[in-house]
Interface confidence: medium
C-alpha cells in the first residue's frame, strides 16, 4: 500500500516522492533498502534527499532498487517504499510499456494530455511535445502550462505522447522525458436548442453599491459531447473584452457540469466595486450551439439598505 513504482531513463533527472505523506515540518529520512545506507541530504551529491523528495540528478542504471523513506513526527513514524528502476535509453523510437505512464482518454470536447510527474520538478517553459517520436507542429497543438491541448480531436490523434522539459537544480539543467498513451473516445449523444437555467429572462438582480457582484450564466445543451456549445456574457450588446470596463470581467474558461445527464456550461460575470452607472447597463447571458442562440437579459437594481429602525 505504501510502496510506489518509479522509473526513469539514465542521464535524465528523476525525482521521487515518498509514498507516505506528512506535514512539511516533519523530517523525512531516506535509506537505500538493500544496504540500509542513509541517503545524504547535501545537494552536491548526485543522489540526495530533500524532504519528501528523493532526487537523482542525473539518474544511473545502477541507482535501481528499493528506497525507504521514514516520515518522522513528534508522535509517530511512517514508513514508505519507493521501487526505482532506471532504464537505458532506447536507440529506436519505440517507448516500451514499462516506461509508459497511465493512459488518458480524450474527446472533441476535452483533449488535455497532462505531462506525467512534472509537478515534482522545477521546470520552466517551453514544454516540448512529441507524438510517436515526432515533434508536434501545427496550430491544432497548443502546449499550455503542464499539458497539451489538441484542437478538433480526431481518431488519428490517438497514440503515444512524450513531453520533454528541463529541470533546474542550483543552476544546473537536467533533461526529463515522460510518455503516456492517448486514446480518443467517440461520444454519441444529442444536442438541443440551448436551455438557459439562469438567469431568468428579464431578471432584476439586487446589488449593493461599492460591493462586488457575481452573475452566473448557466445553460444546458444536450447529452454527450456538445459541438460548439458556449455560454458568454455581453454588455449592452458588446463583448465583455470590447466593452472596456476593467471592473467587469468574465471568468476565464467555461465550467462544464452535468445536470440530470445533460451537458451544461456556466460562465460567471464578476463586477468589482459596483457603481451607479452599472445599474444602467443591460447584461445579456448568451447560450449558443448548433441549433441557435438564446439570450436572457438581466438588469441590476440597488439593494435597499435594511432599515434597523422600528
Amino acid at each position: 500500500k505504501f510502496s510506489k513504482q518509479s522509473w526513469g531513463l539514465e542521464n535524465e533527472a528523476l525525482i521521487v516522492r515518498c509514498p507516505r505523506q506528512g506535514k512539511p515540518s516533519y523530517t523525512v529520512d531516506w535509506y537505500y533498502s538493500q544496504t540500509n545506507k542513509s541517503i545524504p541530504t547535501q545537494e552536491r551529491n548526485r543522489v540526495f534527499a530533500s524532504g519528501q523528495l528523493l532526487k537523482f540528478l542525473p539518474a544511473a542504471v545502477a541507482d535501481s532498487g528499493i528506497y525507504t523513506c521514514i516520515v518522522r513526527s513528534p508522535t509517530f513514524n511512517r514508513t514508505g517504499y519507493a521501487n526505482v528502476t532506471i532504464y537505458k535509453k532506447q536507440s529506436d523510437c519505440n517507448v516500451p510499456d514499462y516506461l509508459m505512464y497511465s493512459t488518458v482518454s480524450g474527446s472533441e470536447k476535452n483533449s488535455k494530455i497532462y505531462c506525467p510527474t512534472i509537478d515534482l520538478y522545477n521546470w520552466t517553459a517551453p514544454l516540448e511535445w512529441f507524438k510517436n517520436c515526432q515533434a508536434l507542429q501545427g496550430s491544432r497543438y497548443r502546449a499550455h502550462k503542464s499539458f497539451l491541448v489538441i484542437d478538433n480531436v480526431m481518431t488519428e490523434d490517438a497514440g503515444d505522447y512524450t513531453c520533454k522539459f528541463i529541470h533546474n537544480e542550483n543552476g544546473a539543467n537536467y533533461s526529463v522525458t515522460a510518455t503516456r498513451s492517448f486514446t480518443v473516445k467517440d461520444e454519441q449523444g444529442f444536442s438541443l436548442f440551448p436551455v438557459i437555467g439562469a438567469p431568468a429572462q428579464n431578471e432584476i438582480k439586487e446589488v449593493e453599491i461599492g460591493k462586488n457582484a457575481n452573475l452566473t450564466c448557466s445553460a444546458c445543451f444536450g447529452k454527450g459531447t456538445q459541438f460548439l456549445a458556449a455560454v458568454l456574457w455581453q454588455l449592452n450588446g458588446t463583448k465583455i473584452t470590447d466593452f472596456g470596463e476593467p471592473r467587469i470581467q468574465q471568468e476565464e474558461g467555461q465550467n462544464q457540469s452535468f445536470s440530470n445527464g445533460l451537458a451544461c456550461l456556466d460562465m460567471v460575470l464578476r463586477i468589482a466595486d459596483v457603481k451607479e452607472e452599472d445599474l444602467l447597463l443591460q447584461y445579456d447571458c448568451l447560450a449558443l450551439n448548433l441549433h441557435g442562440l438564446r439570450r436572457h437579459t438581466v438588469r441590476l437594481s440597488r439593494k435597499n439598505p435594511i432599515d434597523h429602525h422600528s
Epitope: 472533441e108 444529442f190 459541438f227 458556449a230 458568454l232 448548433l290 441549433h291
Partner: antibody
Framework: QVQLVQSGAEVKKPGSSVKVSCKAS????????MHWVRQAPGQGLEWMGV????????KYAQKFQGRVTITADESTSTAYMELSSLRSEDTAVYYC?????????WGQGTMVTVSS | EIVMTQSPATLSVSPGERATLSCRAS??????LAWYQQKPGQAPRLLIY???TRASGIPARFSGSGSGTEFTLTISSLQSEDFAVYYC?????????FGQGTKVEIK
Amino acid sequence: QVQLVQSGAEVKKPGSSVKVSCKASGYTFTDYYMHWVRQAPGQGLEWMGVIIPVLGAAKYAQKFQGRVTITADESTSTAYMELSSLRSEDTAVYYCAKGWGAFDIWGQGTMVTVSS
Amino acid sequence: EIVMTQSPATLSVSPGERATLSCRASQSVSSYLAWYQQKPGQAPRLLIYGASTRASGIPARFSGSGSGTEFTLTISSLQSEDFAVYYCQQYYSYPWTFGQGTKVEIK
C-alpha cells in the same frame, strides 16, 4: 435585407492557396454561425466548416482538417475561408451560408478553378 | 458521420402533379433536418427546417414531414419554377451532411 456577398472567381495553380471572402449585411454578424459549403461541377453539396464570430471558434470537416482555415472580421462583418495545398479536385463553387444548423441565407458562390 | 441517402435520384413529374421526395438518415437525426432547392447556376435556397417548418417566403405547396431516420418533402402541385435539384441535410450532429440530391425534371 439580409445578404452575403462573396469575392470573385479565382484561378489557382496546384499546391497554392486561395482565400475567399464573404461580406455579410442586414443582420447582426456575431449572432450567427457562418458555414462554408462547396460544390464540385455536377456534384452535390459538401460542408467544409463553420465559424462562430462571437466566439472566434471554428470547426472543420475531417476531410479538410489541416488544409482549411475559416476566420471572421467582426469590424467589417466579413468571413473568410482559406484552402491550402490546392489540387485539381478542389475545383468547385465555394459558398458561405448563414445559419445555425439549417442555412437560411447563402452567398452567390465563388468559382475556384485549380489548373496547372 | 451520419450518411444521408435521397431517393429517387431523378423524379419525372408533369406540371400540376404532386412530387414526393424521400430522405433517409443512417441514424436518428430527430427533427434536425432541412431541405434545400437549387436551380442551375444558383445558390441553394432553404425550403424547410426542423423537418416540417417552412422557411420565410416559401410557398405553402412545399411541406416536410418525418422524424428520426425517414423524411419526406412533398410538393403538392408542381409549378414550372419548381423543377430543380433538392437536397436534404441533417444538423443533428457534427459534421453536417447532405444527401446526394434528387433532380425533379419535367415529364
